[in-house]
């Protein structure tokens, strides 16, 4: 029972963690205008991982896609890769976890072929949820770096007289959004993985060695018989590898109407 | 037909207050960012004030600021402008503008006269 | 504050006559994340509220007749009437739609020779 209540718990943070991600994927506000410190314009600008936006106080938002792959900055476009491949190995996970779920019977399926499905779908869960982690960072670091930037030269004269304001960007929501769905998805992972130790049958393990005497055949066993609880020695834990880079946003931007500025 | 009325204009002593009205029609109010915009006779026009759609965001002159409210009514379809203190230089013919593309003021009412006179 | 500085005050001109007249704002008015300028030119004519012409500085408003042109960008703008008609014969203002306080120019008066 409490093996089946982790499995579906974990499949619905892992869920909603996914949902996150894909949300935060497709939001606009991954840097958005700092407002703090700096003169009141009649504009705000806020940047997505494919579009950059412009809501004006008139009530107009105008927004231009990056219609370009190759003029976009690297680390943008690596953002763009890990929150892809986090969505990716997550809607895959959430596949596989749906037929490892004790509670749907499908055929003839053996307990230990559902443990194999949960252990995956976890492993896919964990993964994803990293990916999510990492490419927010990475966005994040590079936010950072592009604040205190454009905040050393926040004001570039024109022989003191003529005065150009320097946009600043800082955290937009969906950064925000990013870490705590990538968070729930890898908690929802480990949870998958959790259940599978209780999913897995008990199994003997024997570890015999043979010894042949001569004109005998005699088989010494040693170490005797260790019984497999599901978290002797037996499992094995896999090192998940943590995605890094850095970052660098450069992007600019038809109407829809919201109140901000 | 976007059309904005303005209202509410008169004489009053220096100190009194004052409420316009600005009642909107042809377009959708909610949607738009509006304005108070004055001009004094013989001289250029001046920004007063601006009200956001949802009127979460609000920006006065520095020359009305603690003095002036601007506020809307976006069931009634209509924008106010509540004027106190009243000084002589803020005697002014008082324009509501809707607010359009590139946050210019595209489209204005005929104004109503405000004047501070002892 | 925003200052706009309108150059000339007034230009007397003739009758399809081209005629240039200048704003200098005392900060840029090009937003980066549009590229665009927030600059606006209006014209006034006596009696009556003052009529958008354009908008982020180069973009006409619609039933703006073609001989009006906005150009310029950062801090320096300029509006061109290829050929004055009489009926142009008005006060134009440029304003700031990017700092608050939206602020106008002092205004340049076209007048008729």
């Known amino acids: 029972m409490a093996v089946t209540a982790c499995q579906g718990l974990g499949f619905v943070v892992s869920l909603i963690g996914i949902a996150g991600i894909i949300a935060a994927t497709c939001m606009d506000q991954w840097s958005t205008q700092d407002l703090y410190n700096n003169p009141v314009t009649a504009v705000f600008n806020y940047q997505g991982l494919w579009r950059s936006c412009v809501r004006e106080s008139s009530g107009f938002t105008e927004c231009r896609g990056y219609f370009t792959l190759l003029g976009l900055p690297a680390m943008l476009q690596a953002v763009r890769a890990l929150m892809i491949v986090g969505i990716v190995l997550g809607a895959i996970g959430l596949l596989v976890s749906i037929f490892a779920l004790k509670c749907i019977r499908i055929g003839s399926m053996e307990d230990s072929a559902k443990a194999n499905m949960t252990l995956t779908s976890g492993i896919m869960f964990i993964v994803s949820g990293l990916c999510a982690i990492a490419g927010v960072s990475v966005f994040a670091n590079m936010l950072v770096t592009n604040f205190w930037m454009s905040t050393a030269n926040m004001y570039t004269g024109m022989g003191g007289m003529v005065q150009t304001v320097q946009t600043r960007y800082t955290f937009g929501a969906a950064l925000f959004v990013g870490w705590v769905a990538g968070g729930l998805t890898l908690i929802g992972g480990v949870m998958m993985c959790i259940a599978c130790r209780g999913l897995a049958p008990e199994e003997t393990n024997y570890k015999a060695v043979s010894y042949h005497a001569s004109g005998h055949s005699v088989a010494y066993k040693p170490g005797g018989f260790k019984a497999s609880t599901g978290f002797g020695s037996n499992t094995k834990n896999k090192k998940i590898y943590d995605g890094g880079a850095r970052t660098e946003d450069e992007v600019q931007s038809y109407p829809s109407k919201h109140d901000y500025v | 037909e976007v059309k904005l009325v303005e209202s509410g204009g008169g004489l009053v002593q220096p100190g009194g207050s004052l409420k316009l009205s600005c009642a909107a029609s042809?377009?959708?109010?909610?949607?738009?960012?509006m304005a108070w915009v004055r001009q004094a006779p013989r001289k250029g026009p001046e920004w007063v004030a601006f009200i956001s759609n949802l009127a979460y965001s609000i920006y006065y002159a520095d020359t009305v600021t603690g003095r002036f409210t601007i506020s809307r009514e976006n069931a009634k379809n209509t924008l106010y402008l509540e004027m106190s203190s009243l000084r002589s230089e803020d005697t002014a013919m008082y324009y509501c503008?809707?607010?359009?593309?590139?946050?210019?003021?595209?489209?204005w009412g005929q104004g109503t006269l405000v004047t501070v006179s002892a | 504050d925003i200052v706009m500085t309108q150059s000339p005050s007034s230009l007397t001109v003739t009758a399809g006559e081209k005629v240039t007249m200048s704003c200098k704002s005392s900060?840029?008015?090009?937003?980066?994340?549009?590229?665009?300028?927030?600059l606006t030119w209006y014209q006034q004519k006596p009696g009556q509220p003052p009529k958008l012409l354009i908008y982020w500085a180069s973009t006409r408003e619609s039933g703006v007749p073609d001989r009006f042109t906005g150009s310029g960008s950062g801090t320096d703008f300029t509006l061109t009437i290829s050929s004055v008609q009489a009926e142009d014969l008005a006060v134009y203002y440029c304003q700031n739609n990017y700092y608050y306080p939206l602020t106008f120019g002092a205004g340049t008066k076209l007048e008729l020779k």
């Open positions: 503008a809707r607010l359009g593309r590139g946050n210019s003021f595209a489209y």
């Open positions: 042809g377009f959708t109010f909610s949607d738009y960012g």
């Open positions: 900060q840029s008015l090009l937003n980066s994340g549009n590229q665009k300028n927030y």
